[in-house]
Amino acid sequence: AHYNTEILKSIDNEWRKTQCMPREVCIDVGKEFGVATNTFFKPPCVSVYRCGGCCNSEGLQCMNTSTSYLSKTLFEITVPLSQGPKPVTISFANHTSCRCMSKLDVYRQVHSIIRR
Amino acid sequence: AHYNTEILKSIDNEWRKTQCMPREVCIDVGKEFGVATNTFFKPPCVSVYRCGGCCNSEGLQCMNTSTSYLSKTLFEITVPLSQGPKPVTISFANHTSCRCMSKLDVYRQVHSIIRR
């Protein structure tokens, strides 16, 4: 079958845009660390990179193959306000590279880490 | 309290990066339409813009305030392969602007649409 060049070009573009790669996501700090309900962070979220996107097959999962850790400073506010906002430094995992891995390999990898 | 300029700059940067705005996300087409298990799409995902990010308060939600519609062409493959890939066109809404809205307003808005 012959397909219009425009269609093939736009499909190729979609492949590239949706591939498994590190993507900027917003992490809600309070939810991530499960802090007390009277503790708030300003800003409430931080921007980190996490693996995301689609793999070419149902049996594959987009997983990180390397990680770097970075620290970010936020203000922590505890209610009632007995003192002003306190700067706190929090460390986050940043996914720096990703790969489509078989779900079975991912399962094995996770379980070998748990077993250690 | 006086805070280090570097800290204030990095916090300001975090606010900007995590604010409520249109963000590129990948939508798995097969899962979106719940198609038959022998129907596959190539690429399996499309890239769309959806409102995302964080609002400054628990009672606020990041919602779209304007939308544009666009179409993308993908290939649909039915297994067993009795014929080649067939082009299909997918139309969807892209969020073009967003705002932090009170959850109560969002609830009212959704219910007024449903009632129409």
Epitope: - | I27, K31, F33, A93
Partner: nanobody, 118 residues
């Protein structure tokens, strides 16, 4: 148990129109996605059109511009307006529903015959 009732099929001349409808019942939830497949004699079942609650609509290129899918959420019903019908549109048309979070199963209707012939 989810049940789908289709109607609107029949015999029509080339260039004519038909409107298929499919009503889902038996679930307390609204389907996340609803759509239509078709199967011509001796051929595979193929996806024709679908619509999702996420605001997505899909058309096979062979029907694009001629067929229009729509749904009425209050009635859990999906419609397929078929215009400018051609002989190659002759098939049994099957409706399906998908509930996503509540139920990953896909439910099928019994099918309704559409015949385009002069």
């Amino acid at each position: 148990e989810v049940q789908l009732v289709e109607s609107g099929g029949g015999l029509v001349q080339p260039g004519g129109s038909l409107r298929l409808s499919c009503a889902a019942s038996g679930s307390s939830f609204s389907p996340y996605a609803m759509g239509w497949y078709r199967q011509a004699p001796g051929k595979q079942r193929e996806l024709v059109s679908a619509t999702s609650s996420g605001g997505f609509t899909l058309y096979a290129d062979s029907v694009k511009g001629r067929f229009t899918i729509s749904r009425d959420n209050s009635k859990n019903t999906v419609y397929l307006q078929m215009n400018s019908l051609r002989a190659e549109d002759t098939a049994v048309y099957y409706c399906y529903t998908y509930y996503r979070e509540y139920d990953p199963e896909m439910y099928w209707g019994q099918g309704t015959q559409v015949t385009v012939s002069s």
